[in-house]
């Protein structure tokens, strides 16, 4: 998995006029990291993990950058011609990545009312847009505005690319993020389903990175996909992830079933608690 820094900025307009506030979210390696959600932006670390990455530094620099980006985006929204009455949103997502071979990728994407209408590869400066006529109209509109803006020159896009990577490298230097591995906590619960059946759920939480195998086995053999239900792998707000898998089994057959977990080269198996015991928790 490459290391990544992702900026997500959203500005709103109501009945033709752009609202003054904006929302900015920054994700580091897919984890919520920084957030600004006030009229006056003050970059706030998202959890202890983000504070550990940022160290004792103040977040003036992040605050300044995000405020500037928010201001730019508000100006862009003001130039979108087809604003009908009601609430509208313009969202800019900028991502940069550093891959294991040290190659880099950077891009930015614009969304109007949640719909993608314009993307740019910040390294090649190549623009792409979806085929729909609405997207094309919006894209032309925004590109024309960006061209007019003296700031949006070739050097500006290179700077955006370079700045993003520079910030990412700065955060990675903290060592908190760099190739860390946090093993999951796994617990298995059971609940009554229909008569004679129970639902067994296996939850893994607090793990990093996000890649994990979690599945049910019967007599040591993996159950087919269609007999299992998986939850998404989601950030849990602590710089780690959580997920779950569930299946329905016949009451009395619990001993035949185990939850199998594999993460970062380690694995474990977890039996179904019997009878009245509701939770069996273990850390490998």
């Amino acid at each position: 998995e490459p290391h990544s820094l992702r900026y997500n900025l959203t500005v709103l307009s109501g009945d033709g006029s752009v609202q003054s506030g904006f929302l900015a979210e920054v994700h580091l390696d897919g984890q919520p990291f920084l957030r600004c959600d006030r009229q006056k932006c003050r970059a706030k670390p998202q959890g202890q993990w983000a504070e550990d990455v940022l160290g004792n530094k103040t977040w003036d620099r992040e605050t300044r950058d995000l405020t500037g980006n928010g201001k730019d985006l508000r100006m862009t929204l003001a130039h979108i011609k087809d604003q009908k009455e009601g609430l509208h949103s313009l969202q800019e997502i900028r991502v940069c990545e550093i891959h294991e071979d040290n190659s880099t990728r950077s891009s930015q994407h614009f969304y109007y009312d949640g719909e993608l209408f314009l993307s740019q590869n910040l390294e090649t400066e190549e623009w792409t847009m979806p085929q729909s006529s609405r997207a094309q109209t919006l894209a032309m509109n925004v590109r024309n505005f960006l061209k007019e803006d003296a700031m949006k020159t070739k050097t500006h896009y290179h700077a955006m690319h370079a700045d993003c990577l520079q910030e990412l490298r700065r955060y990675l230097k903290s060592g908190v993020v760099l190739r860390r591995t946090v093993p999951p906590m796994v617990n298995v619960t059971r609940s009554e389903a229909s008569e004679g059946n129970i639902t067994v759920t296996c939850r893994a939480s607090g793990f990093y990175p996000w890649n994990i195998t979690l599945s049910w086995r019967q007599d040591g053999v993996s159950l087919s996909h269609d007999t299992q239900q998986w939850g998404d792998v989601l950030p849990d707000g602590n710089g780690t992830y959580q997920t779950w898998v569930a299946t329905r089994i016949c009451q009395g057959e619990e001993q035949r079933f185990t939850c199998y977990m594999e993460h970062s080269g380690n694995h474990s198996t977890h039996p179904v608690p019997s009878g009245k015991v509701l939770v069996l928790q273990s850390h490998w």
């Epitope: 993996s222 185990t258 694995h267 039996p271």
Partner: antibody
Framework: EVQLQQSGPELVKPGASVKVSCKAS????????IYWVKQSHGKSLEWIGY????????VQNQKFKGKATLTVDKSSSTAYMHLNSLTSEDSAVYYC???????????WGQGTLVTVSS | DIQMTQTTSSLSASLGDRVTISCRAS??????LNWYQQKPDGTVKLLIY???RLHSGVPSRFSGSGSGTDYSLTISNLEQEDIATYFC?????????FGSGTKLEIK
């Protein structure tokens, strides 16, 4: 390559006990169950039970409860089956097997002949 | 316990023949049926799992079919190395049970 190497033949007296070993190699031992199967001379196969090497959990055929005890030694990637109070009925070839996670008894050991005779 | 019946205990066929070995379960086993080959020296190998899935490395002349209680193993083009005893086994219900085996010989 997955391999299960079983201990050599055993000649034991009635009433005694025996421990058959099954050393696994070519895969992560604690990832997959070890199954045990009995084949009496010229007869079919009978499933004895299985053990999860990760946590030592076992599931056994009722018929062999009290007769066979399944254990593992994770440090040597070896599974054991202890057979007690042996009688002539226990004379058989005993196989260990493991799975690839997709099918039962995917890979088999070469078998261990246990002969109970006075 | 579920009884697995292989009615043919031994079978004689010529090299190149198509051979079918059948197996019947005493109740529906929902396709949880595996086939194993045991060579005269005692070596056991998995051939087919879940009725029709060929285990890796097994020649494609082996195939399996069936459903409910009736299952079969087919060898499409018998070769000398196929001389062995073939066992079916159900994995649906504990205890796992095996058929009594079908010994395949060359005419």
């Amino acid at each position: 390559e997955v391999q299960l190497q079983q201990s050599g033949p055993e000649l034991v007296k009635p009433g005694a006990s025996v421990k058959v070993s099954c050393k696994a190699s070519g895969y992560a031992f604690t990832k997959y169950n070890i199954y045990w199967v009995k084949q009496s001379h010229g007869k079919s196969l009978e499933w004895i039970g299985y053990i999860d090497p990760y946590n030592g959990g076992t599931v056994q055929n009722q018929k062999f409860k009290g007769k066979a005890t399944l254990t593992v030694d994770k440090s040597s990637s070896t599974a054991y089956m202890h057979l007690n109070s042996l009688t002539s009925e226990d004379s058989a070839v005993y196989y260990c097997a493991t799975t690839d996670g997709y099918s039962l008894f995917t890979y088999w050991g070469q078998g261990t002949l246990v002969t109970v005779s006075s | 316990d579920i009884q697995m019946t292989q009615t043919t205990s031994s079978l004689s066929a010529s090299l190149g023949d198509r051979v079918t070995i059948s197996c019947r379960a005493s109740q529906d086993i929902g396709n949880y049926l595996n086939w194993y080959q045991q060579k005269p020296d005692g070596t056991v190998k998995l051939l087919i799992y879940y009725t029709s899935r060929l285990h890796s490395g097994v020649p494609s002349r082996f195939s399996g079919s069936g459903s409910g209680t009736d299952y079969s193993l087919t060898i499409s083009n018998l070769e000398q190395e196929d001389i062995a005893t073939y066992f079916c086994q159900q994995g649906n219900t504990l205890p796992f049970t095996f058929g009594s085996g079908t010994k395949l010989e060359i005419k």
